[in-house]
Interface confidence: low
């Protein structure tokens, strides 16, 4: 009696269990009473990456220079390429289709996690005690200078955006 | 056609810059990443780094980081050099390459097109 | 970084003989995906670097068919069948795995 369902890494047709081609390959032709499942090595810049009975394998993604994007790991015949964004510049989804630039920080406010390739900067605001003065995707929140330590005084309150202002003591008269 | 035309021979004083541009055209510029690779008089081939001309992303070599810049106008499609701090032995014939970049083979990126050369003398 | 090591680094021939040219890296060249990351460029007297062979052994655009390469891992070989006085300067091989790309020293091929 013909089998109505098959083994791992087998696929029913004809009434009968042909084997799958491995990761790396697709399907030629397939198998017969007579015959195994005849498979072929993708192309140089082709990939499968299950065992399968595709006719065509896959393409590489292309990482298009246009769109910021590089190499971050050669296909083979078993992967896909991998892109990933230029230096400065973050993944705009998961699969890293095109790239943006990374976020600065206003003043106000501070780095709280630096992008990477794949998510943009995190920001968050300068808490009372710490400032930051500049627009930037890597300077965090710096603290407001300690006057006291210098041997100084506070002049000049500080802001979520300025340092205070230190200045020596008044002159005793 | 597709082409590299580089700027004349520089003749520069130790410690000083010089900077060399190349420019491209009969292709899309920003398509194509941009090396620089130099050779000494009897010395044999080395590579500096590259520039991505699309988003000006860079990769030096290490021996030149902290002395090379490249960067790029898109809008007049050229790449430029410049070497800081010139040392008598940066004595060289510096060429612009442009690296093939696509799908076939297997994305592997070669140098096909080169510029005709920029002779930079270091001499004081 | 990768070292390359070309020999002979002269190489007199005479017209219509073949010549060879080795080249050996101090790593694997071979990646993942079977292919090597290996190139040949020749540096003709007056000109700029011209691709001849990628991949270790295929054939550049325009290349003419007696340059042929061949090898795997960390050992190549460019081959010139019936050499041509056109073919005399300087063969270098260059890996192009990992940045930075690096050359071989240079093989001189000058006609007897």
């Known amino acids: 009696e013909p089998p109505t369902a098959c083994r791992e890494k087998q696929y029913l047709i004809n009434s009968q269990c042909c084997s799958l081609c491995q990761p790396g390959q697709k399907l030629v032709s397939d198998c017969t009473e007579f015959t195994e499942t005849e498979c072929l090595p993708c192309g140089e810049s082709e990939f499968l990456d299950t065992w399968n009975r595709e006719t065509h394998c896959h393409q590489h993604k292309y990482c298009d220079p246009n769109l910021g994007l590089r190499v971050q790991q050669k296909g083979t015949s078993e992967t896909d390429t991998i892109c990933t964004c230029e230096e400065g510049w973050h993944c705009t989804s998961e699969a890293c289709e095109s790239c943006v630039l990374h976020r600065s920080c206003s003043p106000g406010f501070g780095v709280k996690q630096i992008a990477t390739g794949v998510s943009d900067t995190i920001c968050e605001p300068c808490p009372v005690g710490f400032f930051s003065n500049v627009s930037s995707a890597f300077e965090k929140c710096h603290p407001w200078t300690s006057c006291e330590t210098k041997d100084l005084v506070v002049q000049q309150a500080g802001t979520n955006k300025t340092d205070v202002v230190c200045g020596p003591q008044d002159r005793l008269r | 056609q597709v082409q590299l035309v580089q700027s004349g021979a520089e003749v520069k004083k130790p410690g000083a810059s010089v900077k060399v541009s190349c420019k491209a055209s009969?292709?899309?510029?920003?398509?194509?990443?941009m090396h620089w690779v130099r050779q000494a008089p009897g010395q044999g081939l080395e590579w500096m780094g590259w520039?991505?001309?699309?988003?000006?992303?860079?990769n030096y070599a290490q021996k030149f980081q902290g002395r090379v810049t490249m960067t790029r106008d898109t809008s007049i499609s050229t790449a430029y050099m410049e070497l800081s701090r010139l040392r008598s032995d940066d004595t060289a014939v510096y060429y612009c390459?442009?690296?093939?970049?696509?799908?076939?083979?297997?994305?592997?990126?070669?140098?096909?097109?080169w510029g005709k050369g920029t002779t930079v003398t270091v001499s004081s | 970084d990768v070292v390359m090591t070309q020999s002979p680094l002269s190489l007199p021939v005479t017209p219509g003989e073949s010549a060879t040219i080795s080249c050996r890296s101090s790593?694997?060249?071979?990646?993942?995906?079977?292919?090597?990351?290996l190139d040949w460029y020749l540096l003709k007297p007056g000109q700029s670097p011209q691709l001849l062979i990628y991949l270790g052994s295929n054939r550049a655009s325009g290349v003419p068919d007696r340059f042929s390469g061949s090898g795997s891992g960390t050992d190549f070989t460019l081959k010139i069948s019936r050499v041509e006085a056109e073919d005399v300067g300087l063969y270098y091989c260059?890996?192009?795995?990992?940045?930075?790309?690096?050359f071989g020293q240079g093989t001189k091929l000058e006609i007897k």
């Open positions: 009969g292709y899309t510029f920003t398509g194509y990443y």
């Open positions: 520039i991505n001309p699309n988003s000006g992303g860079t």
């Open positions: 790593q694997s060249l071979l990646y993942s995906n079977g292919y090597n990351y």
């Open positions: 260059m890996q192009g795995l990992e940045t930075p790309y690096t």
């Open positions: 390459a442009r690296e093939r970049v696509g799908a076939t083979p297997t994305y592997y990126y070669y140098m096909d097109v």
